[in-house]
């Protein structure tokens, strides 16, 4: 594959990454799959600067990010280390709340209306953000 040098149409470039902001809602797993099919991943927030950028674009709306603990520990979908990385949880979060009555806990992270993070039921239909790095090789064959 060739190295992607510019963002696809309708994607926003920022700091050598491309971002796509949904305007509809999907369950976390469906959002995750949508991004993968776009050769991208749910957004991985690695700095306060990136947090502010994403927050600016999504507004005060619950929005999925690429962080979950469905298999035990919290993991970023691209393998970025959670323990040493940037975090922006709301106070008392994540709390893995079982009291919602939907069966199970809260295993997927989202931006809340003030931008800080919360863990919630993964099947809730929230908006989502896809991210892909400009410097990574795309799956498309190079133009001859």
């Amino acid at each position: 594959g060739s190295e992607r040098t510019c963002c696809p149409v309708n994607w926003v470039e920022h700091e050598r990454s491309c971002y796509w902001f949904s305007r509809s809602g999907k369950a976390w797993a469906d959002a995750d799959n949508y991004c993968r099919l776009e050769d991208a991943h749910l957004v991985v927030v690695t700095s306060w600067e990136e947090q502010k950028f994403v927050q600016h674009h999504i507004g005060p709306v619950n929005t999925w990010m690429g962080l979950h603990d469905q298999n035990g520990p919290w993991k970023w979908v691209d393998g970025t280390d959670y323990e040493t990385g940037f975090k922006n949880w709301r106070p008392e979060q994540p709390d893995d709340w079982y009291g919602h009555g939907l069966g199970g806990g809260e295993d997927c992270a989202h931006f809340t209306d003030d931008g800080r993070w919360n863990d919630d039921v993964c099947q809730r239909p929230y908006r989502w953000v896809c991210e892909t790095e400009l410097d990574k090789a795309s799956q498309e064959p190079p133009l001859l």
């Epitope: 797993a29 959670y82 099947q123």
Partner: antibody, heavy 120, light 111 residues
Framework: QIQLVQSGGGLVQPGGSLRLSCAGS????????MDWVRQAPGKGLEWVGR??????????EYAASVKGRFTISRDDSRNSLFLQMNSLKTEDTAVYYC???????????WGQGALVTVSS | QSVLTQPPSVSGAPGQRVTISCTGS?????????VHWYQQLPGAAPKLLIY???NRPSGVPDRFSGSKSGTSASLAISGLQSEDEADYYC???????????FGGGTKLTVL
């Protein structure tokens, strides 16, 4: 006390089908992932697959060796877990265990096991 | 060939201490996933022995202890007793396989 009681094992011919059941009691069944693990005669433990809870849309994962042939489902209203096994092969012969998942990643309670023998 | 590597067998005299190793890779143990240990007595279903690398469920004697470092983990059994004779399995989640992986199992013989 917490119990997982299994049923449905038996002898089946290659290419045949079988359904295993696992009934949970003594805890809130709907709040836990459930897995199936198998053990061929004289061999080690092999993970078969997982079904998550409703909050995670009952999503499933399967080992490569059974993907496309086995289906895991659950009925929270009946506190029951199921393993539907199709296109069975001789190498599927094993004792099958259901197991409850604690904190999303370890087995804290196991069923008693159900022997599945695939032979002509 | 198991994804997690354990010695096939270990042995020790009553009262002795033995350790069982479990070596993984960057997609399981090294990816930050905890290692759990299960004991399987002859003819019985497996039983949780150690969870989260080093935690003992209630009812498990403190003779059993676990640890993890990097891509490896180990189970130590001190003050060996005849009833400890069993198969021991380590397990962890694996990102590459998107599932649980087990070690091949270690048969403990109390001499």
């Amino acid at each position: 006390q917490i119990q997982l009681v299994q049923s449905g094992g038996g002898l089946v011919q290659p290419g045949g089908s079988l359904r295993l059941s696992c009934a949970g009691s003594g805890y809130t069944f709907s709040d836990h992932y459930m897995d199936w693990v198998r053990q061929a005669p004289g061999k080690g433990l092999e993970w078969v697959g997982r079904i998550r809870y409703k909050a995670n849309s009952y999503s499933t994962e399967y080992a490569a060796s059974v993907k496309g042939r086995f289906t895991i489902s659950r009925d929270d209203s009946r506190n029951s877990l199921f393993l539907q096994m199709n296109s069975l092969k001789t190498e599927d012969t094993a004792v099958y265990y259901c197991a409850r998942i604690r904190d999303r990643y370890y087995f804290d309670y196991w069923g008693q096991g159900a022997l599945v023998t695939v032979s002509s | 060939q198991s994804v997690l590597t354990q010695p096939p067998s270990v042995s020790g005299a009553p009262g002795q201490r033995v350790t069982i190793s479990c070596t993984g890779s960057s997609s399981n143990v090294g990816a930050g996933y905890d290692v759990h240990w299960y004991q399987q007595l002859p003819g019985a279903a497996p039983k949780l022995l150690i969870y989260g690398n080093s935690n003992r469920p209630s009812g498990v004697p403190d003779r059993f202890s676990g640890s993890k470092s990097g891509t490896s983990a180990s189970l130590a059994i001190s003050g060996l007793q005849s009833e400890d004779e069993a198969d021991y399995y380590c397990a962890a989640w694996d990102d590459s396989l998107n599932g649980v992986v087990f070690g091949g199992g270690t048969k403990l013989t109390v001499l």
